[in-house]
């Protein structure tokens, strides 16, 4: 009975025309929503003009029904056993799960005055950034939209700038009529041990910004895992949001639409500075702002975001140092809302609820040059946004799983 | 202290052109808007339109595209508006206003104007 | 184009009286800098305009404190506390938050 079933599975888990696996795969039948919560800064001027603690306040949730669109350009390689594929981005807004619209105003950070000033340490070329700053009269925080904000609008300053740069700003700018990838993943035809495993991502093993094997893609995209997944293994997964593979943890047993799950959480050691977790080493990559690679629960991915100052953390700076939050005033950070959890089927190895947080973070820094920026004293780590992307099995799907994986094992 | 002084009144036939010219002193000319603004015999006040002497950037209001144009001369800190195809609608004072943003510590919006240029159109 | 509607048209007051000044815009003056460039001028009869209240409620240097300016967003408000001769003339709000910019019709301050 058992090997029966364990041939069913690793039949059934292949990625390929014909199987449960790939239909799922190609368009996934879960419905995933991101929750936007935007953090409001209540006291521009106060922090431009004396350096104070920013204070912020989150708005949200502004709710985007995301990853509806098949996957694409999917190309079965018999070779190697692998499939290669684009995976489509698409957001539309959901306004019945959301506390406003889309032309809510919001004042955050001015992310071209806080980019550039990074992106162009040069004291001359700064006195040219700061008299067109001052023509656009653009400053150290903005009023915008939602829309704008996290889809993209022309920025004033930007638009002076006399060569040509890219004038178009915002957090996932650009998004919709965009693909990540090219993924090519394991099909499981020769071993199923290493089916959704990614083999390269955009043509290559490696990532090319972090050195040694940070720079690694380990694992799958987290969307499922090889079969017959044990408590005690250490799940592998590449996120591009984060430019990076990361890990998981057994946590605990869950019991989803009577399907019995495992839950895998992001363990806050993944999060840890060299100093507590010597296996991050190589994700500190500067050692100023770090504090000499002391500070954790933040991760500069400037070197994947065309040099731009971002910063990746956990929601309200979950797991990091307290040096990261004490220029910051607003923040409650609550494991239960803000940790990342994935819920897996350990014989289909296939996630069935997940729940991703993470927070997008600016870097801006004090300018003797840019005025907008020379009162400040110190290094602020701006809390922009943080996303909760999640998705649950549908109540048929959930049925169907029962009736045709679980029922029969049990 | 800033002063901004205009070119004096004048008289000037119908379809006929003016230039008008506006002085700075007192700050630094090349990095702060120069505005202008029309004022009819007892009405209010019209922005024509501004610009950025350091580069000459310009912008104008719809309504005067093509009746004014801004230029400005850095050497001598001076700014003009020509006024074209002139005729009795264009008799006004215009006025020069400068418009300093300084990375939002000095930002006061037309803060010193000049005392005006009388432009009268008559044949 | 961004209308400032201005109200009164004409405001009689007696020196010492408080006066009140409203001016209305079409669309909102928040600038996406986090400002609000609403300005006050006086203007008297053959002068230049003369700035009073700059970005909605700060006074100009030199500028006596019984003048005050309130609002945001669309509505704006100048007060003076007690009238004095040298207050009267016309008084005109103004916005630079955008292009092209735009006055209200102005209010006549005058004697009752």
């Known amino acids: 009975g058992d090997m029966l079933i364990q041939k069913t599975i690793k039949k059934e888990v292949v990625l390929e025309e014909g199987t449960i696996a790939f239909k799922n795969w190609v368009k996934t039948g879960t419905e995933i929503y991101r929750q936007f919560w935007i953090f409001d800064v209540q006291n521009p001027q106060e922090v431009m003009m004396n350096s104070s603690n920013i204070q912020v306040k989150q708005r949200g949730p502004y709710t985007y029904r995301v990853r509806f669109l098949a996957k694409e350009n999917i190309t079965q390689d018999p070779k190697d056993n692998t499939v290669s594929f684009l995976q489509p981005n698409g957001a539309i807004f959901e306004p019945s799960l959301s506390v406003g619209t889309e032309a809510d105003n919001f004042t955050v950070l001015n992310l071209a005055v806080a980019a550039a000033s990074h992106i162009y340490p040069n004291p001359f070329v700064q006195v040219v950034l700061n008299s067109l700053i001052n023509k656009s009269k653009s400053s150290m925080f903005q009023v915008r939209t939602l829309r704008e904000l996290l889809w993209g609008y022309t920025d004033p300053f930007l638009s002076l700038v006399p060569y040509p740069v890219s004038t178009r700003v915002g957090m996932f700018y650009p998004y919709n009529n965009t693909a990540d990838g090219v993924y090519k993943v394991f099909n499981g035809k020769d071993s199923i041990s290493k089916v959704a495993i990614i083999d390269t991502y955009k043509g290559k093993r490696n990532l090319s910004y972090w050195e040694s094997y940070c720079d690694m893609i380990n694992g799958t995209d987290a969307a499922s895992f090889p079969p017959f997944v044990e408590k005690s293994q250490v799940l592998q997964f590449f996120s591009s949001d984060i430019c990076r593979s990361i890990y998981a943890v057994f946590e605990s047993d869950v019991n989803l639409k009577g399907i019995p799950v495992y839950r895998f959480v992001l363990p806050s050691k993944a999060f840890a500075s060299p100093v507590q977790n010597p296996d991050n080493h190589c994700f500190c990559t500067e050692k100023i702002i770090s504090k000499n690679c002391t500070s954790y629960g933040v991760l500069d991915i400037s070197k994947c975001k065309e040099g731009k100052p971002v910063y990746i953390s956990l929601p309200h700076f979950l797991y990091a140092s307290p040096d990261v939050s004490e220029t910051i005033d607003g923040l409650n950070p609550n494991e239960e809302e803000h940790r990342t959890y994935l819920d897996i089927e350990p014989i289909t190895g296939f996630t069935l609820q997940f729940a991703k947080r993470l927070q997008v973070n600016l870097l801006v820094k004090p300018s003797n040059k840019i005025q907008v920026l020379k009162r400040l004293k110190r290094n602020y780590i701006v809390p922009i946004l943080w996303l909760n992307e999640t998705g649950t099995i549908g109540d048929e799907k959930a049925k169907m799983f029962r009736s045709q994986v679980t029922g029969k094992i049990n | 202290q800033v002063q901004l002084q205009q070119s004096g009144p004048e008289l000037v036939k119908p379809g006929a052109s003016v230039k008008i010219s506006c002085k700075a002193s007192?700050?630094?000319?090349?990095?702060?808007?120069m505005n202008w603004v029309k004022q009819r015999p007892g009405q209010g006040l019209e922005w024509i339109g501004r610009?950025?002497?350091?580069?000459?950037?310009?912008n104008y209001n719809g309504k005067f595209k093509g009746k004014a144009t801004l230029t400005a001369d850095t050497s001598s800190s001076t700014a003009y508006m020509q006024l074209s195809s002139l005729t009795s609608v264009d008799s006004a004072v215009y006025f020069c206003?400068?418009?300093?943003?300084?990375?939002?510590?000095?930002?006061?919006?037309?803060?010193?104007w000049g005392q005006g240029t009388s432009v009268t159109v008559s044949s | 184009d961004v209308v400032m509607t201005q109200t009164p048209l004409s405001l009689p007051v007696s020196l010492g009286d408080q006066a009140s000044i409203s001016c209305r815009s079409s669309?909102?003056?928040?600038?996406?800098?986090?400002?609000?460039?609403l300005h006050w001028y006086l203007q008297k009869p053959g002068q230049s305009p003369k700035l009073l209240i700059y970005?909605?409620?700060n006074r100009f240097s030199g500028v006596p404190d019984r003048f005050s300016g309130s609002g945001s967003g669309t509505d704006f408000t100048l007060k003076i506390s007690r009238v004095e001769a040298e207050d009267l003339g016309v008084y005109f709000c103004?916005?630079?938050?955008?292009?092209?910019?735009?006055f209200g019709g102005g209010t006549k301050l005058e004697i009752k």
């Open positions: 669309q909102s003056l928040l600038h996406t800098n986090v400002n609000t460039y």
């Open positions: 103004s916005q630079s938050t955008h292009v092209p910019y735009t």
């Open positions: 970005k909605v409620s």
């Open positions: 206003a400068r418009e300093v943003y300084y990375g939002g510590y000095e930002d006061y919006g037309m803060d010193y």
């Open positions: 007192g700050y630094t000319f090349s990095t702060s808007w």
């Open positions: 610009i950025y002497p350091g580069d000459g950037d310009t």
